[in-house]
Interface confidence: low
């Protein structure tokens, strides 16, 4: 027999045995040109000394073979004696060491058996009724296909599934969607209605994330507030990466989980924009305000669960940076200005009422005054900070007030509102004899002492009523007692105490008269 023809004789070996685990398998035959055909197969097991024979039986009942030697691929023409327009049955017999192994048969019409391509190019993936829907353009001139998929997870081997028949310019497949693990899918096609025809190669991997993106397990730390009034938010622990199936490791598109940082600035609610979303890699600088921070995970199917943290306000205060002057027309605050055209947000809240909403005012963009100061004024009628109590004041600044991450803290301090001079006057001043020439003066703490950094000092004034001589004694704001020495027995004195702030002299307390009794010796 000629090598280019199918030999209509019995092959030169004994009968085949199909019960072996090794041997030929996955036979596929198809047309490769108008008159050319190809069959190929896999061989499982040791290949040394193996001879392969492609067997063919025609519909007439005549059978023939091609001897291919060690090759597992054969090309032949429509002149090789095999009917290409009628149904034929083909299989492979492999002979080695006096033993023959047989592949499963394929029954087909060779002329109609076109080698189908797998889905090529972009395979669109979406979610439909809890399942995965894949869609792709049908390869050119290959409308009418049966489609299979195979899928695996990081911990499972391939499982085969059927997409059913396709008969359009676009093809699609419904596949199972895993809730919590990534999957790798591959698709293959063959001609519709020709069960014996061969499958295409498997497509490139389609990597699909779990339906639920993983809970982002991250930790943050916040640096100290810098001199520029900003502090850096840093990521202490990266989100754990999703475990991926073998074919999705490397730069596999589609399976990525993206993490976004959602910042919500709680302070200064009167500003234009309170929330900003940015990529997790781009860790922002924050002002000293309080923030809520959420990390949101999402994949190609949308957002998943998020993790939320509260970043408390930076409570570090600067007692001297703010100047407040109270005049007949109203009150004006002065503080060291930032750059030209800066918007300031002034926020205040009575101490002890941190749960309630702070009062907030946004200035128009302003330039520094000749003294390099920025100002904010309000009238007495507005009632702002009018009550005699302690207020916590924070001032934020931004040259771009709509950009949440560009706010910085100018200062954070305390102020005693209303008539601080009168309200701060110490009460319950008492005098006790201490020795023959000294007394101890005590008083109740000024209301100003409840306001951190506001009370600069107490001043104790002692007047000798005989000579009208006056002495004044400064006392630390944390003390409420002083000893007056070098006093003379029998002389009448009056003592008064006042509480001073950095910008305001307090009102004297009611005069308290005392004298040291003259000691009469027996």
């Amino acid at each position: 027999c000629r090598t280019s023809e199918c030999c209509f004789q019995d092959p030169p070996y004994s009968d085949a045995d199909s019960g072996s685990a090794s041997g030929p398998r996955d036979l596929s035959c198809y047309r490769i040109s108008s008159a050319g055909y190809e069959c190929s197969w896999q061989y499982e097991g040791p290949t040394a000394g193996v001879s392969h024979f492609l067997r063919c039986c025609l519909s007439s009942g005549r059978c023939c073979y091609f001897a291919t030697g060690s090759a597992t691929r054969l090309q032949f023409s429509d002149q090789a004696g095999v009917s290409v327009l009628h149904t034929v049955t083909l299989w492979v017999e492999s002979w080695a060491r006096n033993r023959t192994e047989k592949s499963p048969e394929v029954t087909l019409q060779l002329y109609k058996s076109v080698k189908y391509k797998p889905p090529l190019g972009d395979i669109k993936v979406s979610k439909l009724a809890g399942q995965l829907r894949m869609e792709w353009e049908t390869p050119d001139n290959q409308v009418g296909a049966e489609v299979q998929f195979r899928h695996r997870t990081p911990s499972s081997s391939w499982k085969l599934g059927d997409c059913g028949p396709q008969d359009d310019d676009t093809e699609s497949c419904l596949c199972p969607l895993e809730m919590n693990v990534a999957q790798e899918f591959q698709l293959r096609r063959r001609r519709l209605g020709s069960q014996g025809s061969s499958w295409s190669k498997w497509s490139s991997p389609v990597c699909v994330p779990p339906e639920n993106p993983p809970q982002p397990q991250v930790r943050f730390s916040v640096e100290q507030l810098g001199r520029d009034g900003r502090r850096r938010l840093t990521l202490k622990e990266q989100p754990t990466q999703l475990e991926l199936p073998e074919g999705c490791q490397g730069p596999a598109p589609g399976v990525e989980v993206t993490y976004q940082l959602q910042l919500h600035m709680l302070s200064c609610p009167c500003k234009a924009k309170a929330t900003r979303t940015l990529p997790l890699e781009k860790m922002p600088y924050l002002s000293g305000a309080a923030y809520n921070v959420a990390v949101i995970s999402s994949n190609r199917f949308g957002p998943g669960p998020n993790q939320t943290w509260h970043i408390p306000a930076d409570t570090h205060t600067e007692p001297v940076a703010l100047n407040i002057s109270v005049g007949t027309n109203g009150t004006t605050m002065y503080w060291p200005a930032r750059a030209q055209s800066t918007t300031y947000c002034i926020e205040w809240q009575p101490v002890g009422q941190e749960g309630s909403l702070a009062t907030c005012n946004l200035t128009a963009p302003q330039d520094p005054d000749p003294a390099g100061m920025a100002t904010y004024s309000w009238s007495r009628e507005s009632g702002a900070m009018g009550q005699e109590k302690c207020y916590h004041i924070t001032i934020f600044a931004s040259a771009h007030p709509k950009k949440l991450t560009l706010w910085s803290t100018v200062l954070s301090t305390y102020h005693f509102g209303g008539n601080a001079s009168a309200a701060g006057t110490p009460h319950h001043v008492s005098v006790k004899n201490h020795s023959l020439d000294s007394v101890s003066v005590d008083w109740a703490p000024s209301l100003l002492s409840t306001c951190p950094g506001v009370l600069k000092e107490y001043v104790v004034r002692c007047r000798d009523e005989d000579s009208n001589q006056v002495s004044e004694h400064p006392v630390q704001p944390t003390e409420t007692q002083v000893t007056l020495s070098d006093l003379r027995a029998g002389v009448a004195y009056t003592v008064q105490v006042r509480a001073d702030t950095a910008w305001l002299r307090g009102a004297w307390s009611q005069p308290q008269r005392f004298s040291i009794k003259v000691q009469v010796s027996d």
């Epitope: 049966e146 059927d162 997409c163 059913g164 028949p165 396709q166 008969d167 419904l174 069960q195």
Partner: nanobody, 114 residues
Framework: QLQLVESGGGLVQPGGSLRLSCAAS????????MSWVRQAPGKGLEWVSY????????TYVDFVKGRFTISRDNAKNMLYLQMNSLKPEDTAVYYC???????RGQGTQVTVSS
């Protein structure tokens, strides 16, 4: 035009069986794969099973494997779902679906309760 009519639903006790049927018309039934889906009260659609056009390939969602069997009779244009060992969580409206274009019937109610 394409029409799918489900029947065979009803009330059954846990552990019991039902056989759902779907009569197809208006298309070449034997050329298309078919699916069963279900919708439990207050929930979305849930895919249950698929059978290829010739009936050679069948596939099931994990939680019905071994209990449900899909089959078809292309000569009669009929699709079936044999449901055994039914559980209360199988309570739903069951629909048969044309797997290529997603058309479905009006559904049949299955209630599993003691």
């Amino acid at each position: 035009q394409l029409q799918l009519v489900e029947s065979g639903g009803g009330l059954v006790q846990p552990g019991g069986s039902l056989r759902l049927s779907c009569a197809a018309s208006g298309f070449t039934f034997s050329s298309y794969g078919m699916s069963w889906v279900r919708q439990a009260p207050g929930k979305g659609l849930e895919w249950v099973s698929y059978i290829s056009a010739g009936g050679g390939t069948t596939t099931y969602v994990d939680f019905v494997k071994g209990r449900f069997t899909i089959s078809r009779d292309n000569a009669k244009n009929m699709l079936y779902l044999q449901m055994n060992s039914l559980k209360p969580e199988d309570t739903a409206v069951y629909y048969c679906v044309h797997a290529a274009d997603g058309s479905r019937g009006q559904g049949t109610q299955v209630t599993v309760s003691s």
